[in-house]
Structures are given as structure tokens and as C-alpha cells.
């Protein structure tokens, strides 16, 4: 990519953060070995990456979780990458699912999501999970990012 | 990306190689359908990708492994993407984990890691696993790569 | 990337489509929140992404499936990303595998594949699975795409 004013590099990689909130939206932080290329992408309220320029973006998320089939609901663990366009309803871009493990007290599993999507100026992307209390926040296990093509 | 002298394309994709070494660092080779764009990224000692230019890189790894919960330690199989900056200690960039299968003698599972990270000139990245003897080296199952944004 | 005539952005993201065909090649559609940057990449016969320009591409696929070890053949579920170069035999680029779940009637699992490969003009890529009837086609669960570096 050119790095001139016309077409600066836009990229972000943020790190998961444990949260006491009961919301299913994962929380993220600019900590550890994070990336935030410039102010054309920002982390808002610790929960969503918001872009200022229209274009195609490769967006990805990785979620590691620890669950047990007896202790969990019967439904699988699902991670969803969601889009909130400006002034419009949110929609699902990508989802992945894993059935719970029989390991005790819980079994670790990792999910990776990634895809190319058109984002409008002011669009935000965020990650939803079925049970945020099961997410693993150890170094490197859960992260979220994007890059503008 | 421009392909002029100022901003050449930098990309690599290397293929797993079985190793008799007992190290937890995976071994890779330029074989099969591999990619090595130019000498601005190199595979060193068959174990790490080293870059000559500073910048943001999307780095990824995929590891397929075959494990069994009785035969393995109780700890999950963990794959780690690690960074060795020049003249500094190594650090973990990304990790993923999967609990062992109950299949006999072992059950196959795949892990995918990927994220955007700033690399300095001379920085190396490599992949670590908890048990390299469980890694599957059949065509296409285990690979490692990067691209400069 | 420059967006001039010389080096236009080339990217695609297509969405899985259920098929009555018994072929192991997955079917895709330009539906939902899909991406097709221009006619330098096309979806052919609903099954393969074909590119018109030579170069390095990051190619990815995500497959979510629901299987049960009793109801399935006992072999693992395997997803393969395959290349069909013009006038040459197809070859495997990437594969991932997951052992079947014991959940009833079936357990969800997701596989993600991604890597950087050189494609020739007219080359096609497609996704093969061991049992297409097990693939989950709900919003966001199964998708396929590429971007030219």
C-alpha cells in the first residue's frame, strides 16, 4: 500500500479484555502487542472498531473459550462478527460455532473468523459471543482486527 | 501494493516439515506450493520467517494435529505464534488451544491463527506447539505465512 | 493498493449455498453481504473463484459443519482449498480436519483456512469437503474469498 496522504495504511489489532458487563459483546483494549495504524480506525467504548474511510476491509477475530457440555446450555458456543453501519441496523458478517467439550472443568477451543467486507465511513464492527464468561483472556488467545485493502 | 523498488510486495507461505528434533518450534520448508516473494523475507534455519523491512504485517499459521485425551497430558494442545525482535526477548503474539479428542489412537483437529503486527527490520516470527509429535504434515494441513501491508 | 487501471483492487467474498448436487465441491452465491470487486475475479458455476490477473493472492475459506460420530463415516470431516490452474490438474493448497462430535443429533464445528498463493490468469480456486450434507448454511457460517496483494 502507498503510505501517502491519499492512501494511508489503515490497520488495527486489539486484545481481549475481561469485562464484568453481562453483555454478549466482547471488550477489547489497546494493550500488549496491539496495532492502531492511525486515527482512520479507532476502538470505541472498548467494544467496536470504527473506520473513517469507505472501502474494502479484511476483518478478522479469534476467540478462545473454555466450556463444558454439562455446565453449559446445550447450544454450541457461537462467535459472531457483526457490522453496525452508520444509521442502520446491525447485521452478522461471519459466525463460527463449536460444540462444548466434555473435558472437566472445561475444555479449551479456538475459533477464527475472517473475511473481506465493504465498510462505509463511520461503520463499526464488533464481536458477539453466546457466553462471554467462557472466553479466555490469556496472552494471545483472543483478538480482533482489520486492515483496509 | 506497488511493485516498484520503493515498495515491493513482501509475502511468504511455507509448508510444514516433520522433524526428529525434540524442540517445540515447528519446522518449515520451501516445498510444494510455497511462496517466497523476494529476499526481503527469508526462512531461516527452517524455523522462522525473518523480515528485512519495518512495517505492518498480517501473519498467519495453521496447524493440524492428531491427539487423544488419554494418551496426552491433560493440558490442551496449544499453538503459539511468537515474535523474536532483533536483540530482544521473544514474545507471544497469538495463541490457540484445542482440547484433545477421544478418537483412537488420536483425533484430528485444526487450529488457525492470524493477526496484524508491527515488525522491525530483522524481526523473526515462528510457531511453537505443545507437542510437535502430534502435528500432521500431510499435504496442506500445516502451514505458516505472512504478507506486508 | 493503488486503485488505478494498472493495479485495481481485486477481492471477493461469497456466501455458501445449499445444493442438491452430490458433489463434494461446495456451492457459493453472490448474496447477502458479499463482495465482488470487479470483473477481474468472478464466481463461475457457483463453485469456483476465477481470477484474470497473475499475482499473489490471500485466499481463505470458512466452513461450519454439524456432524455426529455415530451418524457419520468414522473418518474426520475434512475441508480442502483447491487450485485448478488453466490447462493443468487441480491440486490441494490447504486442508483442515476435525473429528466428529458426540453431540446429538450433531455437533457444530468450524474450520478456517487461509494462505498466500501465486495464481496464474484463468486460475480457479474452490472448496471441497468430505460430506457437503453436513455443512451449515446459516447466515455467516460458511464463506469463501480472496484478495490480490
Amino acid at each position: 500500500m502507498q503510505k501517502g496522504d491519499q492512501n494511508p495504511q489503515i490497520a488495527a489489532h486489539v486484545i481481549s479484555e475481561a469485562s464484568s458487563k453481562t453483555t454478549s459483546v466482547l471488550q477489547w483494549a489497546e494493550k500488549g502487542y496491539y496495532t492502531m495504524s492511525n486515527n482512520l480506525v479507532t476502538l470505541e467504548n472498548g467494544k467496536q472498531l470504527t473506520v473513517k474511510r469507505q472501502g474494502l476491509y479484511y476483518i478478522y477475530a479469534q476467540v478462545t473459550f473454555c466450556s463444558n457440555r454439562e455446565a453449559s446450555s446445550q447450544a454450541p458456543f457461537i462467535a459472531s462478527l457483526c457490522l453496525k453501519p452508520p444509521n442502520r441496523f446491525e447485521r452478522i458478517l461471519l459466525r463460527a460455532a463449536n460444540t462444548h467439550s466434555s473435558a472437566k472443568p472445561c475444555g479449551q477451543q479456538s475459533i477464527h473468523l475472517g473475511g473481506i467486507f465493504e465498510l462505509q465511513p463511520g461503520a463499526s464492527v464488533f464481536v458477539n459471543v453466546t457466553d462471554p464468561s467462557q472466553v479466555s483472556h490469556g496472552t494471545g488467545f483472543t483478538s480482533f482486527g482489520l486492515l483496509k485493502l | 501494493m506497488q511493485k516498484g523498488d520503493q515498495n515491493p510486495q513482501i509475502a511468504a507461505h511455507v509448508i510444514s516439515e516433520a522433524s526428529s528434533k525434540t524442540t517445540s518450534v515447528l519446522q518449515w520448508a520451501e516445498k510444494g506450493y510455497y511462496t517466497m516473494s523476494n529476499n526481503l523475507v527469508t526462512l531461516e534455519n527452517g524455523k522462522q520467517l525473518t523480515v528485512k523491512r519495518q512495517g505492518l504485517y498480517y501473519i498467519y499459521a495453521q496447524v493440524t494435529f492428531c491427539s487423544n485425551r488419554e494418551a496426552s497430558s491433560q493440558a490442551p494442545f496449544i499453538a503459539s505464534l511468537c515474535l523474536k525482535p532483533p536483540n530482544r526477548f521473544e514474545r507471544i503474539l497469538l495463541r490457540a488451544a484445542n482440547t484433545h479428542s477421544s478418537a483412537k489412537p488420536c483425533g484430528q483437529q485444526s487450529i488457525h491463527l492470524g493477526g496484524i503486527f508491527e515488525l522491525q527490520p530483522g524481526a523473526s516470527v515462528f510457531v511453537n506447539v505443545t507437542d510437535p509429535s502430534q502435528v500432521s504434515h500431510g499435504t496442506g494441513f500445516t502451514s505458516f505465512g505472512l504478507l506486508k501491508l | 493498493m493503488q486503485k488505478g487501471d494498472q493495479n485495481p483492487q481485486i477481492a471477493a467474498h461469497v456466501i455458501s449455498e445449499a445444493s442438491s448436487k452430490t458433489t463434494s465441491v461446495l456451492q457459493w452465491a453472490e448474496k447477502g453481504y458479499y463482495t465482488m470487486s470487479n470483473n477481474l475475479v468472478t464466481l463461475e458455476n457457483g463453485k469456483q473463484l476465477t481470477v484474470k490477473r497473475q499475482g499473489l493472492y490471500y485466499i481463505y475459506a470458512q466452513v461450519t459443519f454439524c456432524s455426529n460420530r455415530e451418524a457419520s463415516s468414522q473418518a474426520p470431516f475434512i475441508a480442502s482449498l483447491c487450485l485448478k490452474p488453466p490447462n493443468r490438474f487441480e491440486r490441494i493448497l490447504l486442508r483442515a480436519a476435525n473429528t466428529h462430535s458426540s453431540a446429538k443429533p450433531c455437533g457444530q464445528q468450524s474450520i478456517h483456512l487461509g494462505g498466500i498463493f501465486e495464481l496464474q490468469p484463468g486460475a480457479s480456486v474452490f472448496v471441497n469437503v468430505t460430506d457437503p450434507s453436513q455443512v451449515s448454511h446459516g447466515t455467516g457460517f460458511t464463506s469463501f474469498g480472496l484478495l490480490k496483494l
Epitope: - | 516433520a18 493440524t64 492428531c66 488419554e70 494418551a71 478418537a103 483412537k104 489412537p105 488420536c106 483425533g107 484430528q108 502430534q134 500432521s136 504434515h137 500431510g138 499435504t139 494441513f141 | 460420530r69 463415516s73 468414522q74 473418518a75 474426520p76 475434512i78 486442508r95 480436519a97 473429528t99 466428529h100 468430505t130
Partner: antibody
Framework: QVQLVQSGAEVKKPGSSVKVSCKAS????????ISWVRQAPGQGLEWMGW????????NYAQKFQGRVTITADESTSTAYMELSSLRSEDTAVYYC???????????WGQGTLVTVSS | DIQMTQSPSSLSASVGDRVTITCRAS??????LNWYQQKPGKAPKLLIY???SLQSGVPSRFSGSGSGTDFTLTISSLQPEDFATYYC?????????FGQGTKVEIK
């Protein structure tokens, strides 16, 4: 219908090696495991090792470790078992068999008689 | 290694008899126990897998039971074609091991 067809009988000298092949047809050989089991004349069954052909993972019985090598060629749907440093007590019928999730062996080759004699 | 002990080592029975063969593991193998039938000069044939699951195509007169260390193969009504040697096999841990076999002969 899955079929496993093994190579023909062999007569070998002590200290030499033998390589037995097992070609699969009629099923998805490559995504299952292949085990090798031997049976000495008038004796019971003895498991030697296992390979997952397309993945390349192997497991060996400790008794044969270092003396047996199991390989597979995905392109030809063929598995191989090579046993080195042969001795007279290795005289046996060697079977390949397809192994499934629970470690059961559901399809067997016809067997290959290997005779070790000076 | 896990030792598998079958009993009896041989038995004589008549057509129509109910026959029971037992297999004991030297340590718990959960349900990872398989049963095979072998006739002279032939390869073994899978009858029962995972302790009690009947292999496709095998007559329903064959059944398996047990878990942990003690397992049983039962032939509810012996048929002429059932005279053979029967082996149990554990697949819980490497190396997989077989019992020494039980030969079922005509009385």
C-alpha cells in the same frame, strides 16, 4: 465396497528388510487410519502400528519401535509397512486393516506371508 | 502394555447353543473393546466395536457387553458358520493388544 489388497508372499534372509504394500480401493482410504497386525503361525494377533495416510501421523508399538516404518502414498491409496533387521521369529502373516474412530479394524487385507529363513 | 485375557481358551458347543466368551483387561479401558472372528487361512472379521456396537452386516445373534475391565461376547444361538476363533482387542491405549483367542469347536 472397501477392499485392501496386499502384496505377495516374501522369503527373506535374517538381517534383511521387507516392505509389504496395501492398496485400497472402493472407499475413502486416505481419511481413515491403517493398522498393521501380524500373526505368527498358529499364534494370536499382534498389533504393530498405525498410520493416518493423508495426515501422516503414526503410532508404533514399543516392541517394534526403530525396526518398523509405516508410510502411505495418498496419490495411489497405498500404505506400506517396512520391517528391518528380520529374524526367524518375524515369520508371520502380516495384515493391513482399516481403523476407525474407536480403534476398531473393520476391513482387512488378505494377508502377506513373510518367511524369514537362512 | 495392557494385557487382555480371554476365557475360555477353547470351548465345544452344539448348533443352537448360547455361547459366552469373556475378556478381561489388566486395567480399565472404558468401552474401547472390539471383538473379531477368524477362520483358518482367513483374515479376522470385525463383529462388535466399542464394547456393544454391532458391526454392519453382522448377524444380530452376536452381542457385546461390559465396560471398564470386564467384557463379554455372546452368541445367542450358535450356527454352523460360527465355528471359528474369536479375539478381543483393546484400543484404549497404545499399543493396541489382543486377547490370546478363544476357539469355538463343534461338540
Amino acid at each position: 465396497q472397501v477392499q485392501l489388497v496386499q502384496s505377495g508372499a516374501e522369503v527373506k534372509k535374517p538381517g534383511s528388510s521387507v516392505k509389504v504394500s496395501c492398496k485400497a480401493s472402493g472407499g475413502t482410504f486416505s481419511s481413515y487410519g491403517i493398522s498393521w497386525v501380524r500373526q505368527a503361525p498358529g499364534q494370536g494377533l499382534e498389533w504393530m502400528g498405525w498410520i493416518s495416510p493423508i495426515f501422516g501421523n503414526t503410532n508404533y508399538a514399543q516392541k517394534f519401535q526403530g525396526r518398523v516404518t509405516i508410510t502411505a502414498d495418498e496419490s495411489t491409496s497405498t500404505a506400506y509397512m517396512e520391517l528391518s533387521s528380520l529374524r526367524s521369529e518375524d515369520t508371520a502373516v502380516y495384515y493391513c486393516a482399516r481403523s476407525r474412530y474407536y480403534g476398531d479394524l473393520d476391513y482387512w487385507g488378505q494377508g502377506t506371508l513373510v518367511t524369514v529363513s537362512s | 502394555d495392557i494385557q487382555m485375557t480371554q476365557s475360555p481358551s477353547s470351548l465345544s458347543a452344539s448348533v443352537g447353543d448360547r455361547v459366552t466368551i469373556t475378556c478381561r483387561a489388566s486395567q480399565s479401558i472404558s468401552s474401547y473393546l472390539n471383538w473379531y472372528q477368524q477362520k483358518p487361512g482367513k483374515a479376522p472379521k470385525l463383529l462388535i466395536y466399542y464394547a456393544n456396537s454391532l458391526q454392519s452386516g453382522v448377524p444380530s445373534r452376536f452381542s457385546g457387553s461390559g465396560s471398564g475391565t470386564d467384557f463379554t461376547l455372546t452368541i445367542s444361538s450358535l450356527q454352523p458358520e460360527d465355528f471359528a476363533t474369536y479375539y478381543c482387542q483393546q484400543s484404549d491405549s497404545i499399543p493396541w493388544t489382543f486377547g490370546q483367542g478363544t476357539k469355538v469347536e463343534i461338540k
